[in-house]
Interface confidence: low
Amino acid sequence: DGAPLPLKEEEILPEPGSETPTVASEALAELLHGALLRRGPEMGYLPGSDRDPTLATPPAGQTLAVPSLPRATEPGTGPLTTAVTPNGVRGAGPTAPELLTPPPGTTAPPPPSPASPGPPLGPEGGEEETTTTIITTTTVTTTVTSPVLCNNNISEGEGYVESPDLGSPVSRTLGLLDCTYSIHVYPGYGIEIQVQTLNLSQEEELLVLAGGGSPGLAPRLLANSSMLGEGQVLRSPTNRLLLHFQSPRVPRGGGFRIHYQAYLLSCGFPPRPAHGDVSVTDLHPGGTATFHCDSGYQLQGEETLICLNGTRPSWNGETPSCMASCGGTIHNATLGRIVSPEPGGAVGPNLTCRWVIEAAEGRRLHLHFERVSLDEDNDRLMVRSGGSPLSPVIYDSDMDDVPERGLISDAQSLYVELLSETPANPLLLSLRFEAFEEDRCFAPFLAHGNVTTTDPEYRPGALATFSCLPGYALEPPGPPNAIECVDPTEPHWNDTEPACKAMCGGELSEPAGVVLSPDWPQSYSPGQDCVWGVHVQEEKRILLQVEILNVREGDMLTLFDGDGPSARVLAQLRGPQPRRRLLSSGPDLTLQFQAPPGPPNPGLGQGFVLHFKEVPRNDTCPELPPPEWGWRTASHGDLIRGTVLTYQCEPGYELLGSDILTCQWDLSWSAAPPACQKIMTCADPGEIANGHRTASDAGFPVGSHVQYRCLPGYSLEGAAMLTCYSRDTGTPKWSDRVPKCALKYEPCLNPGVPENGYQTLYKHHYQAGESLRFFCYEGFELIGEVTITCVPGHPSQWTSQPPLCKVAYEELLDNRKLEVTQTTDPSRQLEGGLAGHHHHHHHHH
């Protein structure tokens, strides 16, 4: 089957009667008031161009309408990593709360207590804050009854918002509830919520708003309670989210419980430059977008852009462009293109472009005329076999027809000259060159097609078989669709390469394909009457997507719902039209394109591109199996159009694939179902300040080690080696905390043992912070500090002098015993009077 047809937001039209209230940018109160007045299920889809599939937030200044479900038209820009378990909620994967540490250079103060006021709401709050705070404000609505305070315990980064617990008799006497919960996370993060329970009465209202976050930017409505359902996930693309709950009296139902979690925002997908492409490593901050140009074009601007962190992450520069150069020398040419520069601009209307293509020694060049549209009177193209303007001319557009087989140089160089003097018609030139060994055939080329070969070296005897891309047919048609490299003495192809052309009419019976206007991508010529028949399996229908429709005035494309132009007319399409979709009632569809004779309109872009695919006749998406080691929640019981499946994994498992699947308009899922894979790696434990680490494995799998070492002058505090180990439940963990590198100080020298006394745990040197305790023998009392401490410094010093042991009056008669002790004490025989004696038979006086 062909690739699924992508759904685009602009095709989801508002339902009749839907209201689209505008966002009042003046004040939150006005927005809330307006939204409360307009609540109800009649609100339709958002006809915006929101690039985040899990959001339904209109851009600032657009009219506001709220979808009943999040849409998933493209892969999400950030992972949904919430996992709800019977025991509670925990974060998993890259947006788990432990990753929501303050950015470098900032501090995270403790969250305010429920009683303490948080930072101000609205513009003065600013987006420069780098701490995460969650605040609850209570708005007093002007009524006779006083509102009940909404007391909630909300944690940072991840947590729950619950409707107030109104158990007390005092609370029940108070009528009005009006609460605004404001969640604010770090810049560069958005907030994702999942409705866990929702049981509101008719009179109660819950609004979800994406907080503006910037001065002068009003919050935007994401959903109201009529559009919220249990299991539903919404994402705010800013670092603020507001939940506004209003109840005219004490709630009787179960209220609501909403899980929220910060997720990393991302840069938008950078636009692909015309005549080039872009590859992205990651859309999150730190990710790169690398641009490259098609053959024949040069990059103007930065080759690589980096996604910068910020309140709204953005690329660090403008998207580069790809420009065709007017002339130049191509050394060691292998394969490439010469393309005419865009008319006007830097080169002006008059062009003189000269290219020299030089192949390596012993090679020749084949030049294939891919696309040539020259003004007979004002343009001239000349090709010379050799590298100079004096080389022999082998093609001159003033005299020669465009060679079907292309040109082959006699030498290893070609000299191409293009002259254009204010042409009346747009100049179009694309020449494909290829160097080939002299004892081989040149590599055949087929625009809008594929070439397969028995010998990629194209030696004599090689066969090259041609096939066209969907929408194109071989010309000349039918067999042979292959050519052979013949003649070892001077290899050449035994026939010309065919061409792939978009034909006028045809029969298509594949499950998916393309219908192209004649000669696409060139403009179709006038005087056409083309009929295409599309047929799929009997029990299927045909979904037709009009990708491009840009036909001249008076030209018409008619779609018949059946076999042949006698069937019911499904649509008549004229003039430029936006993308749209049509569905046949049965397995047959007929397309007729009529373009009366008239003056042709030169250049590209006139024509049409229609994609078709067979779709089932029923009105639900196919059933999908639940994930092993995980679960999924569906927004609807039946898998009807618009149903959203949210996938989550058990602790210790991570989701592979898209976490949100949407049943699309064509009854296909927006992505393949994801899988839960056991996490077998530890999180990166990080580098250490004033030290470095060596890891046994870059990915930190179970069993791998990380060894930490400190720079000279620093000592390691903690475990030097961390090991990643597996756990039966939950994610793998490191065996220890990450150590620290503390600045080394010179140790304190042992100050010596006082006469008639001793020390505990005798050492020669004591590190900064270590203490030393002194004791006196029996019959002596300690004069001075019992304990002294080594204070860090250069040099480190003791807090005081060592104490003295003074003879005690009542012990004078015991001199003999003291003398014995002194003569046997080994500390007396050590240098400096230091000792390692550990007797503890002292008296405390």
Partner: antibody
Framework: QVHLPQSRPELVKPGASVKISCKAS????????IHWVKQRPGQGLEWIGY????????TYNQKFKGKASLTADNPSSTAYMHLSSLTSEDSAIYFC??????????WGAGTTVTVSS | DILLTQSPAILSVSPGEGVSFSCRAS??????IHWYQQRTNGSPRLLIK???ESISGIPSRFSGSGSGTDFTLRINSLESEDIADYYC?????????FGAGTKLELK
């Protein structure tokens, strides 16, 4: 005018080797192929192989691998064929010929090699 | 190797007559056949390339035809200078091979 003068006839003993030459003039030597063809007295033609003058790349008929070795000297526009371990079977006229890779449009006059004791 | 069989081995004709030489390949070779003339004690000379393409400097009385496995060289009005051996050569696959030749004699 393209010319391919070849070296003089050779009389050699069995087991010996010989190197014959073919000097090109009148065209760009490095942009052509020089082929060598053997013709035994009263017999037909046998293709030995060719050398790409520009790159020095060679292609041989399997039958002559080990017997013939082709080289070229671009500064002097001369192609050489070295024949080794000669036997009476190698007695023949050896032609050099210019061509593309497929056919031979200009031929040398030939060099006669006689192997005799 | 592709075997080329030329027939007849010897052809006797009178001046002014037309003459045809045949060359048959052991397998299909498209149009990858070339014809050479070799006069007594002389070097071969290219007459026709790719079965039917003429060569500058070669008299127009020489022509070629055929494709696949059967090929023909024609001289539409024989002249005495045409007395020689005629060889066909294939270039469809390695190694390049020649036919055994046809000897043209005067009647």
């Amino acid at each position: 005018q393209v010319h391919l003068p070849q070296s003089r006839p050779e009389l050699v003993k069995p087991g010996a080797s010989v190197k014959i030459s073919c000097k090109a003039s009148g065209y760009g030597f490095t942009r052509s192929y020089i082929h060598w063809v053997k013709q035994r007295p009263g017999q037909g033609l046998e293709w030995i192989g060719y050398i790409s003058s520009g790159s020095g790349g060679t292609t041989y008929n399997q039958k002559f691998k080990g017997k013939a070795s082709l080289t070229a000297d671009n500064p002097s526009s001369t192609a050489y064929m070295h024949l080794s371990s000669l036997t009476s079977e190698d007695s023949a006229i050896y032609f050099c010929a210019r061509g593309g890779v497929r056919y031979f449009d200009v031929w040398g006059a030939g060099t006669t090699v006689t192997v005799s004791s | 190797d592709i075997l080329l069989t030329q027939s007849p081995a010897i052809l006797s004709v009178s001046p002014g007559e037309g003459v045809s030489f045949s060359c048959r390949a052991s397998q299909s070779i498209g149009t990858s056949i070339h014809w050479y003339q070799q006069r007594t004690n002389g070097s071969p000379r290219l007459l026709i390339k790719y079965a039917s393409e003429s060569i500058s400097g070669i008299p127009s009385r020489f022509s070629g035809s055929g494709s696949g496995t059967d090929f023909t060289l024609r001289i539409n009005s024989l002249e005495s200078e045409d007395i020689a051996d005629y060889y066909c050569q294939q270039s469809n696959s390695w190694p390049l091979t020649f036919g055994a030749g046809t000897k043209l004699e005067l009647k």
